[in-house]
Interface confidence: low
């Protein structure tokens, strides 16, 4: 586009330019080719020699222009059509400009500290004759000249007549600029064009509100000499929380989000999340839902799983092994990373479940206690004659650190026998004498396993029919005992319990009870007995 600095045709009032001498250039009202009223300057002192008539415009601010165009529309009379003017008539005039920081006023054109610079000598492509004048065939010439680059704030134009018959119909002064625009979400300011012979003017754009430059490509455009924008380079992208809408970035509406400038559009909130505000850069998980630290913002919110289903167990007593298996939770929480974790509690045989304590490091878990993907586990090294509660918790990527102790678990409570890890027929009556009995039993923990050597056994016995309170007791570290000083031909009740030494000993029960009758004095020899 053209930025007009001066247009003489636009003035309805007198132009009031400075003419020296006073009998030279003269301001005259006229009409243009469309019969619109205009102000013109004319001079026609063609019969007098040595003409030097000057016309100086008012001060013209150059604005942002450095290369300025001067468009002159004028008529010029053909000297040959003027009788008696052959020696003095000229068919050209000169145009000058004078750069200044401020208006020179109406003084002589040469004043002001710097000399006028000549733009050009202007000749007519077409001049008119007396005959044309009579027929009103004024032949309008248009000439455009470029001046600059200018450095001061403004300038005056000056026209020198040296003896022509000329009428200045229009003086138009302008510079070309590329108009302010928005391209690729970047605003580019109105930019004055350089000369047609200069390089393009590179202009950096400014990203529109809520946008930012693309990686490595700050937005740029080039203003061409004709005032047209050329060669866009790079663009802006709407910031996180905003998306492109024509030439601007609009906030993501509630329910939508945009996490990065690299994503072009807002996305609907993933499942189980919401964005209540405009311009959300992420969506907040709904109550009881969460994302794991490794989930991207585009991931659906998920929740911890429900408890494992159908927890079943089997207890084998030789050796003492608890096997568990279960089914996946009914609700995985929307995630595929479900794992299982086991918690083992050893509880008192009676009373509330709260009287429990962790099983401790002695109990072994196969394949492991936590992070199981399998849906089965085995517990080893359980103590005989104890009651165990085992909880199996389902966990996933959004289960908190305390989730295993939370409520999403299934549990079973198991007693490791009716008081001991032996059935009645697992205790051997190895030797029965009139005054002694030898008993043996299998070890509750396999030989060689951790904890096997720590087991102690306590044997309690009393005469059948007597009060249990009148018992006698022996201890042994091996799974065998010989009790002596018994009465012949008497029925005794024997009870065995096993435990590792320590305060938990008292919690173990004496079970089962087996009865053995010593031999009478008359009995011959000793005899081995198979398990009865």
């Amino acid at each position: 586009e053209e930025v007009i600095l001066l247009d003489s045709k636009a003035s309805q009032a007198e132009l009031g330019w400075t003419a020296l001498p006073s009998n030279g250039w003269e301001e005259i009202s006229g009409v243009d080719e469309h019969d619109r009223p205009i102000r013109t300057y004319q001079v026609c002192n063609v019969l007098e020699p040595n003409q030097d008539n000057w016309l100086q415009t008012g001060w013209i601010s150059r604005g942002r222009g450095q290369r300025i165009f001067v468009e002159l529309q004028f008529t010029l009379r053909d000297c040959s059509s003027i009788p008696g003017a052959a020696g003095t008539c000229k068919e050209t005039f000169n145009v000058y400009y004078l750069e200044t920081e401020a208006d020179l006023g109406r003084g002589r054109p040469r004043l002001g500290g710097s000399r006028p610079r000549k733009i050009d000598t202007i000749a007519a492509d077409e001049s008119f004759t007396q005959g044309d004048l009579g027929e009103r065939k004024m032949k309008l010439n248009t000439e455009v000249r470029e001046i600059g680059p200018l450095s001061r704030r403004g300038f005056h134009l000056a026209f020198q007549d040296v003896g022509a018959c000329v009428a200045l119909v229009s003086v138009r002064v302008y510079y070309k600029q590329c108009r302010a625009t928005v391209r690729g979400l970047a605003t580019f300011p109105a930019t004055a064009a350089e000369s047609a012979f200069s390089t393009l003017v590179e202009v950096a754009g400014t990203c529109v509100a809520h946008s930012e430059g693309e990686p490595g490509s700050p937005p740029r455009m080039h203003c061409g000499a004709d005032g047209e924008w050329l060669v866009p380079v790079g663009r802006c992208s709407c910031s996180a929380g905003f998306q492109e809408r024509g030439d601007f970035c609009e906030a993501c509406p509630p329910g939508f989000y945009k996490v990065s400038p690299r994503r072009p559009l807002c996305s609907p909130c993933p499942e189980h999340s919401r964005a209540l505000e405009n311009a959300s850069t992420f969506c907040v998980c709904q109550d009881s839902y969460a994302r794991s630290p490794t989930d991207p913002p585009s991931a659906s919110c998920t929740r911890p799983p429900s408890a494992p289903r159908d927890l079943q167990y089997s207890l084998s007593r030789s050796p003492l092994v608890l096997r568990l298996r279960w089914l996946p939770p009914a609700d995985s929480g929307g995630r595929s990373d479900v794992t299982y974790s086991l918690l083992c509690l050893r509880c008192g045989r009676e009373g509330p479940a709260g009287a429990c304590e962790p099983c401790g490091p002695r109990v072994a878990f196969l394949p492991r206690q936590a992070g199981l993907r399998e849906r089965a586990a085995t517990l080893l090294h359980l103590r005989p004659g104890a009651r165990y509660t085992v909880r199996v918790a389902a966990l996933n990527g959004v289960s908190g650190p305390a989730a295993a102790a939370g409520t999403t678990y299934a549990q079973v409570t198991v007693s490791t026998g009716p008081g001991a890890p032996w059935e009645e027929d697992e205790i051997r009556r190895d030797r029965v004498e009139p005054q002694s009995v030898s008993l043996s039993w299998r070890e509750p923990i396999p030989a060689g396993a951790p904890g096997a050597n720590d087991t102690e056994y306590e044997i309690r016995y009393y005469e059948k029919g007597q009060s249990e309170q009148t018992y006698s007791m022996v201890k042994t570290g091996a799974p065998t005992v010989t009790v002596t000083n018994l009465k012949p031909a008497t029925r005794y009740v024997f009870q065995i319990r096993a435990a590792s030494p320590g305060p938990s000993w008292e919690a173990q029960s004496f079970n089962p009870s087996i009865e053995v009758q010593t031999l009478g004095e008359a009995a011959s020899g000793s005899r081995d007995q198979s398990p009865a």
Partner: antibody, heavy 112, light 106 residues
Framework: QVQLQQSGAELMKPGASVKISCKAT????????IEWVKQRPGHGLEWIGE????????NYKEKFKDKATFTANTSSTTAYMQLSSLTSEDSAVYYC?????WGQGTTLTVSS | QIVLTQSPAIMSASPGEKVTITCSAS?????MYWFQQKPGTSPKLWIY???NLASGVPARFSGSGSGTSYSLTISRMEAEDAATYYC?????????FGGGTKLEIK
Amino acid sequence: QVQLQQSGAELMKPGASVKISCKATGYTFSTYWIEWVKQRPGHGLEWIGEILPGSGRTNYKEKFKDKATFTANTSSTTAYMQLSSLTSEDSAVYYCAIDWYWGQGTTLTVSS
Amino acid sequence: QIVLTQSPAIMSASPGEKVTITCSASSSVSYMYWFQQKPGTSPKLWIYSTSNLASGVPARFSGSGSGTSYSLTISRMEAEDAATYYCQQRNSYPPTFGGGTKLEIK
């Protein structure tokens, strides 16, 4: 889940070249920019540049344009950074990153 | 390129104390990102888009700021917060990091 596994430590001689790899899993490899960051003790973190694997498009920080070259193999979902004409100034830990997921870092030592 | 200046470069704080780390940009940026790095590990995104906590970051952390001035604040310092914190801008390319603030526990 997103994981970036980088190649192991390298000991190189001055003037040599080295190629560091970054194996990406857990996301759509071709559509995310992979960035490379340099960390020297006492010098903090410095962005080297980035590559968009799907198109091969790259952006380099000016000072690394003649030092680093990024490539990517979409079939193996692996990004590479080659560093050439090595000097002691190139001794550093180099990280690959995508959005806010970072690799574990590759230590490069340049010594004669 | 935009230069990010962090202050202080090193500081120590007692448990329970309030901590503020600042990051000043040489030109205006839209958002600031903060990373935490502990010795021998990769940087971890800590705060993104100026004020949003990354997943798993304790609520005692917060971020704020606009234009050329940003900050990371810990309302009550804990031992696990001892680390080096870096700010990063991605508004203008190339992305740049601050020089880091080493936060120690007294």
